[in-house]
Amino acid sequence: KTLVLGKEGESAELPCESSQKKITVFTWKFSDQRKILGQHGKGVLIRGGSPSQFDRFDSKKGAWEKGSFPLIINKLKMEDSQTYICELENRKEEVELWVFKVTANSDTHLLQGQSLTLTLESPPGSSPSVQCRSPRGKNIQGGKTLSVSQLELQDSGTWTCTVLQNQKKVEFKIDIVVLAFQKASSIVYKKEGEQVEFSFPLAFTVEKLTGSGELWWQAERASSSKSWITFDLKNKEVSVKRVTQDPKLQMGKKLPLHLTLPQALPQYAGSGNLTLALEAKTGKLHQEVNLVVMRATQLQKNLTCEVWGPTSPKLMLSLKLENKEAKVSKREKAVWVLNPEAGMWQCLLSDSGQVLLESNIKVLPTWSTPVQP
């Protein structure tokens, strides 16, 4: 008995070959002897029932001249899994068709961190093995149900599942979209008083995007976090529901999600967590955002530079007179110079690769007051 594997919804070709390699009479039947189709000597395909009943069954007329009389079954259904009989040249060929189906749990659009379950449906009597490969090369294998926990952004794309039965295989491709922000975290460095732009680009595109979101903010100086803004998303259009009075954030009306803080102030420095709940999805998308604020001031005979917010312990804060060596450099959040000489002073926040933030302050001769450009 020949075995053919098929995929639900696709086509299968069941072979039937003549030894004479020329056109001959043949008939395809179900195992209960009901006729499906055949050719009775006139080179015409004759179906065994009403067109509506047998419109999924066909043969390859072009192959008949070569002595090949396949049965083509289109739009395969699970119930097509059975034995088919090809009668030709006073012999009967039995062909077993097994139709398989691999589906993803409920939805192919899943949130980052959620689980993906892939389920194999197979005909009674079959004992297939299945292995699925993620777009990033992760292999999972097992029985009829395969699970991947903690989906990551790199898991977005085409998953390939190979079903193996009696040394024959059939391959399924399932497109999975992992819903996430492009970046898990970002840091914005600003001088006091500058406008701050926060952007939250998504790592996926869908036709319609509906949901609601909120930005919670933990200021470095505050004892608890507070909600800065809540918003709705309807068909990719953003509308603000509620915003705090201090600070009064502005939000862009289109994607990507975009927030503007009118000015960076020390009391706003800290970390935020933007959450986005999507319609018909359990769980939320998250993106962390951090704000570091720098202030340079001169009070009487003391020139001070300070930073607020979540900085790496490797960052260096320096005060230097323009075009001169740094007067003071510390891996701390505040530096100062007593009795600074007149000129343009620079406060610099640096790491190993660049100056992240710079603020200039002009120190006038002692009889004048300072000017901040």
Partner: antibody
Framework: QVQLVESGGGVVQPGRSLRLSCAAS????????MHWVRQAPGKGLEWVAI????????YYADSLTGLFTISRDSSKNTLFLQMNSLSLEDTAVYYC???????????????WGKGTTVTVSS | AIQMTQSPSSLSASVGDRVTITCRAS??????LGWYQQKPGKAPKLLIY???SLQTGVPSRFSGSGSGTDFTLTISSLQPEDFATYYC?????????FGQGTKLEIK
């Protein structure tokens, strides 16, 4: 093509000094933090030192402070490691590496040289 | 200085296996951790930076996770070219420190 090539290794007696060089091509050392990392025969990697993009800051492994000095010459696009009072434990392959720093948050050594071998032996 | 403890020190596995290497910091390093691969006679190669960011050109079977003091490198399906020594590096603060390494061998 971004590349780092170390030189200056060799056999040296204990207590003596040696200066290693690392020539950079395809980028400028004055735009990146630059590291030295070493590996004793059959042992793991040991971080040695870093010099910042502007040369303003230098940091060393605790055990090497005062013995080794990291420096660079921007005009020659070259990194150096001056090693004084060498001991048998300083026998190793010395690698230089470039550090990428993004947003004051993401740091990584993405380009490494092939290494130069220093053997301290009496 | 921050101490990094890597485990196991050696590991035998087969092609196709899923492998996990862990690294523990002696204090909180947030997510200041990278993973490097080294083959005999060669310079180290960056795989993962800032705990979970995959370096460009590195196969996606490599992934990193963790935060604070406990970190993990996972190779989802071992390939013949993955047999090497792996090091974690804390770059949260100076002086930087490497883990002692994990030698991944063919079973």
């Amino acid at each position: 093509q971004v590349q780092l090539v170390e030189s200056g290794g060799g056999v040296v007696q204990p207590g003596r000094s040696l200066r290693l060089s690392c020539a950079a091509s395809g980028f400028t050392v004055s735009s990146y933090g630059m590291h030295w990392v070493r590996q004793a025969p059959g042992k793991g990697l040991e971080w040695v030192a870093i010099i910042w993009f502007d040369g303003s800051n230098k940091y060393y492994a605790d055990s090497l402070t005062g013995l080794f000095t990291i420096s660079r010459d921007s005009s020659k696009n070259t990194l150096f490691l001056q090693m004084n009072s060498l001991s048998l434990e300083d026998t190793a392959v010395y690698y230089c590496a470039r550090e990428v720093a993004l947003e004051g948050y993401y740091y990584y050594m993405d380009v490494w040289g092939k290494g130069t071998t220093v053997t301290v032996s009496s | 200085a921050i101490q990094m403890t890597q485990s196991p020190s050696s590991l035998s596995a087969s092609v196709g296996d899923r492998v996990t290497i862990t690294c523990r910091a002696s204090q909180d390093i947030r997510n200041g951790l990278g993973w490097y691969q080294q083959k005999p006679g060669k310079a180290p190669k960056l795989l993962i930076y800032t705990t979970s960011s995959l370096q460009t050109g590195v196969p996606s079977r490599f992934s990193g996770s963790g935060s604070g003091t406990d970190f993990t490198l996972t190779i989802s399906s071992l390939q013949p070219e993955d047999f090497a020594t792996y090091y974690c590096l804390q770059d949260y603060n100076y002086p930087y420190t490497f883990g002692q390494g994990t030698k991944l061998e063919i079973k």
